[in-house]
């Protein structure tokens, strides 16, 4: 028998990825980071 239509049995949690760059003053370049769910990971 074919299966009746149902959604997947698990919930997908979407997280916002935020790229940012912070100027730390002249001659010192910049800090580039990746924030995932509020935590800086890079």
């Amino acid at each position: 028998d074919a299966e009746f239509r149902h959604d997947s049995g698990y919930e997908v949690h979407h997280q916002k990825l935020v790229f940012f760059a912070e100027d730390v003053g002249s001659n010192k370049g910049a800090i580039i980071g990746l924030m995932v769910g509020g935590v800086v990971i890079a």
Partner: antibody
Framework: QVTLKESGPALVKPTQTLTLTCTLS??????????VGWIRQPPGKALEWLAH???????SYNPSLKSRLTISKDTSKNQVVLTMTNMDPVDTATYYC???????????????WGQGTTVTVSS | DVVMTQSPLSLPVTPGEPASISCRSS???????????LEWYLQKPGQSPQLLIY???NRFSGVPDRFSGSGSGTDFTLKISRVEAEDVGVYYC?????????FGQGTKLEIK
């Protein structure tokens, strides 16, 4: 509040085509995940599932009756229509429509039913 | 088709006493998504069916907690911890994992 109401002829003759309408209120069939199905119950007997239609026009039929059934929807009228061809006295039953909604935050069960409409097939 | 077999077909119960209804499927009704779509409905006299339990053990909103569902694979049970007069009617199990959706033949609960 959510309601479903079935309408159609109370009496049809053998070999004729039955057309039943389910009018929905309190929710929209155009809502993602929404679906409406038809179930029937012969006098004194158990329930039998007939067909189901989804918001995206996907349809599912009981294979034993598929050749006789057509389910469709009119989103503008918020109605679902079931037609059954070549009616026979054994098709005498109360016909119900019921709501079912897909989704991880939905019940995904027949949570609201109409009051049913009784159809007698006789010459 | 998946055949749903209920027992007993008739269930006389004294108010305040527990009641149990069995529903067995002819094959597994575990969906490929990991859920088991087994539902219980009550049809009170002269009324449309009403949802009690979905996905084996989840009580629908407004359903008293004296109703509980359990089971897995092919063997399922609806239990009423203390039967009340308003619980009379016909109880149906329904599997919605496979097409066609199939109901049990019904269990008529009556008050002794």
């Amino acid at each position: 509040q959510v309601t479903l109401k079935e309408s159609g002829p109370a009496l049809v003759k053998p070999t004729q085509t039955l057309t039943l309408t389910c009018t929905l209120s309190g929710f929209s069939l155009s809502t993602s995940g929404m679906g409406v199905g038809w179930i029937r119950q012969p006098p004194g007997k158990a329930l039998e599932w007939l067909a189901h239609i989804w918001w995206d026009d996907d349809k599912s039929y009981n294979p034993s009756l598929k050749s006789r059934l057509t389910i469709s929807k009119d989103t503008s009228k918020n109605q679902v229509v079931l037609t059954m061809t070549n009616m026979d006295p054994v098709d005498t039953a109360t016909y119900y429509c019921a709501r079912r909604q897909l989704g991880l935050r939905s019940i995904d069960a027949m949570d609201y039913w109409g009051q049913g409409t009784t159809v007698t097939v006789s010459s | 088709d998946v055949v749903m077999t209920q027992s007993p077909l008739s269930l006389p119960v004294t108010p305040g006493e527990p009641a149990s209804i069995s529903c067995r499927s002819s094959q597994s009704i575990l969906h490929s998504n990991g859920n088991t779509y087994l539902e219980w409905y009550l049809q009170k006299p002269g009324q449309s069916p009403q949802l009690l339990i979905y996905k084996v053990s989840n009580r629908f909103s407004g359903v008293p907690d004296r109703f509980s569902g359990s089971g897995s694979g092919t063997d399922f049970t609806l239990k009423i911890s203390r039967v009340e007069a308003e619980d009379v009617g016909v109880y149906y199990c329904l599997q919605t994992t496979r097409v066609p959706l199939t109901f049990g033949q019904g269990t008529k609960l009556e008050i002794k």
